[in-house]
Interface confidence: low
């Protein structure tokens, strides 16, 4: 019995269906086929869980969280024992193993390993201003999404015809911050933060209005 090499890893957007491949060749009839799919969750590597089991011509549910979401992609018994996971959740990220036995066929590699990463687009980010908006002050524009896998990067733009930040601005696309030093009237305007990762983009807007000192009345 020989389990084929798998592609190594599968990436899927949260909520979509993941297909985890596993196929094998055997010299014996599929009368005593036994297939166990296990997962080592990324969130808890010490706690492997059963995903689905095929034994004695019957399918059995694995861990409760997979109930109703997991099945074999084809009619069993078969030499393609790939599974699907519907409505993928972040907690489904992990290393999946298919263990195949088909007596009396012994020997060879009977385990296939596939990594699953569930990707999450950035949630709508929060835009905030830190610091005084008085003329000549330094301000920090903050942007962050609660969700996003891979971790989002953040791009700040000033929504004028140039889409350029003021010359006194420095941007950190990893932290999602823009520091604008010595703000002037030209710093005023609408700023947009775009949070993006491999599978999604979301935005928030922020209105920066520089406050000029009131002329003193004599």
């Amino acid at each position: 019995l020989e389990v084929s090499e798998s592609p190594g890893s599968v990436q899927v957007a949260r909520g979509q269906t993941a297909v985890l491949p596993c196929a094998f060749s055997t010299s014996a009839a599929l009368l005593n086929l036994n297939v166990i799919w296990m997962v080592i969750p990324l969130s808890n590597a010490n706690q492997p869980e059963q995903v689905i089991l095929y034994q004695g011509g019957q399918m059995f549910d694995g861990a409760l969280r997979f109930h109703g979401r997991v099945g074999f992609t084809g009619t069993m018994p078969a030499t393609n024992v790939s599974i699907f996971i519907n409505n993928t959740q972040l907690s489904d990220t992990g290393t999946y193993q298919c263990l195949v036995n088909n007596l009396p066929d012994r020997g060879g590699r009977n385990i296939g390993v596939t990594g699953l990463t569930v990707l999450v687009p950035p949630s709508a980010p929060q835009c905030q201003i830190q610091g005084s908006q008085d003329l000549g002050s330094d301000v920090i524009l903050l942007c962050s999404s609660e969700e996003g896998i891979p971790r989002p990067t953040y791009l700040w733009e000033k929504l004028d015809n140039t889409l350029k930040l003021p010359p006194t601005a420095t941007q950190d696309q990893v932290q999602g911050t823009v520091t604008i030093r010595n703000i002037s009237a030209l710093s005023s305007g609408l700023y947009q933060c775009v949070a993006s990762n491999a599978i999604g983009t979301s935005t928030c807007l922020l209105d920066l209005q520089v406050i000029s000192p009131q002329p003193r009345s004599v």
């Epitope: 909520g15 999604g200 983009t201 979301s202």
Partner: antibody
Amino acid sequence: QVQLVQSGAEVKKPGASVKVSCKASGYTFTGYYMHWVRQAPGQGLEWMGWINPNSGGTNYAQKFQGRVTMTRDTSISTAYMELSRLRSDDTAVYYCARDPDGSGGSSRWFDPWGQGTLVTVSS
Amino acid sequence: QPVLTQSPSASASLGASVKLTCTLSSGHTNYAIAWRQQQPGKAPRYLMLLNSDGSHTRGGGIPDRFSGSSSGAERYLTISSLQSEDEADYYCMIWHNNAWVFGGGTKLAVL
């Protein structure tokens, strides 16, 4: 299963307002943004805006700003879209549509949609 | 604001294949789109998410007769082995700056 059920057809006079409801079931109402899209007879789809049922925050398409109000009642898992100062060209089918992941982003396509509510504006 | 351009109509024979096009305006050619189908008198249903690299994810229950591909600013929806129920309007759509943008739609006639 997830379902969005909208209120029935309405006939309104120009200048009046209409309020369409969308009752959600089969999922956590506050976990997913709700969008409204309309379609005039024989025309394409037009996005009107969204409401975050959790916070009540809204984002309206510029075209409808000042005329549309989106609200929700979390106790009965229902979203509402009110359009005021109706004109004859507001005659359309109005759809509510759930955002699968609860906020904006290019992979978050509407699914599912309500069955649509026909609003006819006629004097 | 990005613009999505679709041909107003297309036609093909029963059992044949047809390729519908959605063109993204310049500056937005790396956007993913969604294809939707709207059968007469029904709400639009999700067909697939189509990325700029041509990779696509079909919605639940969508047969593999529906496939997507991309080239530059063009996003394609190919329907093979056309069936009478494929006669419908097809829309492409994107998310941009917290808003949805729809193409004008293509009315597909199955002859």
